[in-house]
Interface confidence: low
């Protein structure tokens, strides 16, 4: 339905508060280095303009597209070239090329200062002093550091952030109330950002078809009682929402997401029995709740898939008539029956089925050719099952920190060219799969573990894409979205790697390590471990364990010493010498 003024349409649909917040997020995600006050100024100007269009949709420029209006506004930033370099060239382009250009310059790892959490009193003071600015600042800081954060979900996080401060700044023990809530929001926020980043990578690198396949599988697992036509409708709408958000069309995205939540709740009887509680909540909570809702119970009377997809003589006819619809039905039927499978496994199975039909439907006896297709699925199912079993056993044996270290060594040997901070970040996140998923019963382990690993490996892929250093990473990241994890799992030690020169400075530590949090201290040690492996890629587990044990003892000893700095200097030299000897460097 065409509107005379798109900006007026969205302003009226979303309301002023959400409109301003979403425009701020959009601008911060595009111009990640701009100061907060500059963005606030731009947002206020856009908002004032939108209000004139609401008053008179025929007013000058009100008929322009949102991309044109927002792009024109971003291109008024005086310091664009000096701050962003070649991104300024985007402003010479016309829409839609200009927006595509801005999208290409989004930086997944912007050079921004680490967000340091101040004292609780300081935060409460700031919150009480100017609540609106405080919350805008939160949106700005998250959006600029996470340029693909799902904007309507960020509004939900901001609402929870506000609620935490409203409650806790009045509490007797403010810190005890607030800090756990902020930790939870931070951790959930990082996870949400990474999950959305995978959705955007799926759409942008592999296309709409890949995203739709993912959505069919996931929604079929979640809503196994829904008809295929219903799931297809939801997939189409969900794809539109995520395409818009990943494309920077945040107003349309938020508006369409609200419409989708409304539709789901109005039709919950034909979708899922688990939606009742979600649908009683306010909009932001409702949308979040629906996105996280547990799988509905599977219908009790589902027939075997064999009749329709292997035994029927019409398989090739049905496939030829509408390939993607037929494959979609296969994926839907498979997924609704297998909530115990990861989405990526279901997609591998569907791909195998597609490849088999492509080959067999051109053969002399198609049925004879594809009759044993299900036999090809077995190794595909067993591979992640075995991998998860082995890794959960290792996790239970080692605990999270040492499990992370095992993965650090494993991945550094696979792709030693990757930067140390990226290897540490990715391996730490890979290691979190243990505490996240191994506690689950068998039936929930694979969807938890393998789909989480897909999210983490996508972080590696997007970080590596910014500065490509390894052909092996590029290959695993670009060949197949659903086979990324098996591709990385299959990598052996990189025999072509020339070990890094030994640099004593890398292994020089100071007393400041003693004041770090446990997490930061772990990262320091894990950074040293990656560097060790880069120096000596053929080092055995035992050698590395010995060196790391010595290192832990050294840190503990010097942190207890009266003259810490002297201890770190003297004992550090001894440790470096002993480590070199132990590793034969």
């Amino acid at each position: 339905d065409a509107h005379k003024s798109e900006v007026a349409h969205r302003f009226k649909d979303l309301g002023e508060e959400n409109f301003k917040a979403l425009v701020l997020i959009a601008f911060a995600q595009y111009l990640q280095q701009c100061p907060f006050e500059d963005h606030v100024k731009l947002v206020n100007e856009v908002t004032e303009f939108a209000k004139t269009c609401v008053a008179d949709e025929s007013a000058e420029n009100c008929d322009k597209s949102l991309h044109t209006l927002f792009g024109d506004k971003l291109c008024t930033v005086a310091t664009l070239r000096e701050t962003y370099g070649e991104m300024a060239d985007c402003c010479a382009k016309q829409e839609p090329e200009r927006n595509e250009c801005f999208l290409q310059h989004k930086d997944d790892n912007p050079n921004l200062p680490r967000l340091v959490r101040p004292e609780v009193d300081v935060m409460c003071t700031a919150f009480h002093d100017n609540e609106e600015t405080f919350l805008k600042k939160y949106l700005y800081e998250i959006a600029r550091r996470h340029p693909y954060f799902y904007a309507p979900e960020l509004l939900f996080f901001a609402k929870r952030y506000k609620a935490a401060f409203t409650e806790c700044c009045q509490a007797a023990d403010k810190a005890a109330c607030l800090l756990p809530k902020l930790d939870e929001l931070r951790d959930e926020g990082k996870a949400s950002s990474a999950k959305q980043r995978l959705k955007c990578a799926s759409l942008q690198k592999f296309g709409e078809r890949a995203f739709k396949a993912w959505a069919v599988a996931r929604l079929s697992q979640r809503f196994p009682k829904a008809e295929f036509a219903e799931v297809s409708k939801l997939v189409t709408d969900l794809t539109k929402v995520h395409t818009e958000c990943c494309h920077g069309d945040l107003l349309e995205c938020a508006d369409d997401r609200a419409d989708l939540a409304k539709y789901i709740c109005e039709n919950q009887d034909s979708i899922s029995s688990k939606l009742k509680e979600c649908c009683e909540k306010p909009l932001l909570e409702k949308s979040h709740c629906i996105a996280e809702v547990e799988n509905d119970e599977m219908p009790a009377d589902l027939p075997s898939l064999a009749a329709d997809f292997v035994e029927s003589k019409d398989v090739c006819k049905n496939y030829a008539e509408a390939k993607d619809v037929f494959l979609g039905m296969f994926l839907y039927e498979y997924a609704r029956r297998h909530p115990d499978y990861s989405v990526v496994l279901l997609l591998r199975l569907a791909k195998t089925y597609e490849t088999t039909l492509e080959k067999c439907c051109a053969a002399a006896d198609p049925h004879e050719c594809y009759a044993k297709v299900f036999d090809e699925f077995k190794p595909l199912v067993e591979e992640p099952q075995n991998l998860i079993k082995q890794n959960c056993e290792l996790f239970e044996q080692l605990g999270e920190y040492k499990f992370q270290n095992a993965l650090l060594v494993r991945y550094t040997k696979k792709v030693p060219q990757v930067s140390t901070p990226t290897l540490v970040e990715v391996s730490r996140n890979l290691g979190k799969v243990g505490s996240k998923c191994c506690k689950h019963p068998e039936a929930k382990r694979m969807p938890c573990a393998e789909d989480y690993l897909s999210v983490v490996l996508n972080q590696l892929c997007v970080l590596h894409e910014k500065t490509p250093v390894s052909d092996r990473v590029t290959k695993c990241c670009t060949e197949s979205l659903v086979n990324r994890r098996p591709c990385f799992s299959a990598l052996e030690v990189d025999e072509t790697y020339v070990p890094k020169e030994f640099n004593a400075e890398t292994f020089t530590f100071h007393a400041d390590i003693c004041t770090l949090s446990e997490k930061e201290r772990q990262i320091k040690k894990q950074t040293a471990l990656v560097e060790l492996v880069k120096h000596k890629p053929k080092a055995t587990k035992e050698q590395l364990k010995a060196v790391m044990d010595d290192f832990a003892a050294f840190v503990e000893k010097c942190c207890k010493a009266d003259d810490k700095e002297t201890c770190f200097a003297e004992e550090g030299k001894k440790l470096v010498a002993a480590s070199q000897a132990a590793l034969g460097l």
Epitope: P35, F36, E37, V40, P113, V116, R117, P118, E119, V122, M123, C124, T125, A126, H128, D129, N130, T133, F134, K136, K137, Y138
Partner: nanobody, 124 residues
Framework: DVQLVESGGGVVQPGGSLRLSCAAS????????MGWFRQAPGKEREFVAA????????YYADSVKGRFTISRDNSKNTVYLQMNSLRPEDTALYYC?????????????????WGQGTLVTVSS
């Protein structure tokens, strides 16, 4: 833009007092969080104290709590730092800072405008 000019620094004996002032011009300070930072020779700049826009909320570094008091008079466009029980380790260049959108009062990068500083020397 806001221009900030500090005054009131000088030489004082340990245990003595000083009152620093920060006069703002170019804009009213009522819409700014105001803070004091200091930098001793050879050390990094550190947070001392900050006050909210309304003046109703203050925050101090642990090292100065109970000894220093920050206040503001928005009608005079001025911020003050009353420093009592001064110690030799308080010797530093003291800077006044203003942050329009400072959420994190103790983080120097949140402040948009800075004065040139006034020197405080505590020595017997």
């Amino acid at each position: 833009d806001v221009q900030l000019v500090e005054s009131g620094g000088g030489v004082v004996q340990p245990g003595g007092s000083l009152r620093l002032s920060c006069a703002a011009s170019g804009s009213t300070i009522s819409s700014y969080v105001m803070g004091w930072f200091r930098q001793a020779p050879g050390k990094e700049r550190e947070f001392v104290a900050a006050i909210s826009r309304s003046g109703g909320y203050t925050y101090y570094a642990d090292s100065v709590k109970g000894r220093f008091t920050i206040s503001r008079d928005n009608s005079k466009n001025t911020v003050y730092l009353q420093m009592n029980s001064l110690r030799p380790e308080d010797t530093a260049l003291y800077y006044c800072a203003a942050g329009r959108y400072s959420a994190w009062y103790s983080q120097s990068y949140e402040y948009d405008y800075w004065g040139q500083g006034t020197l405080v020397t505590v020595s017997s």
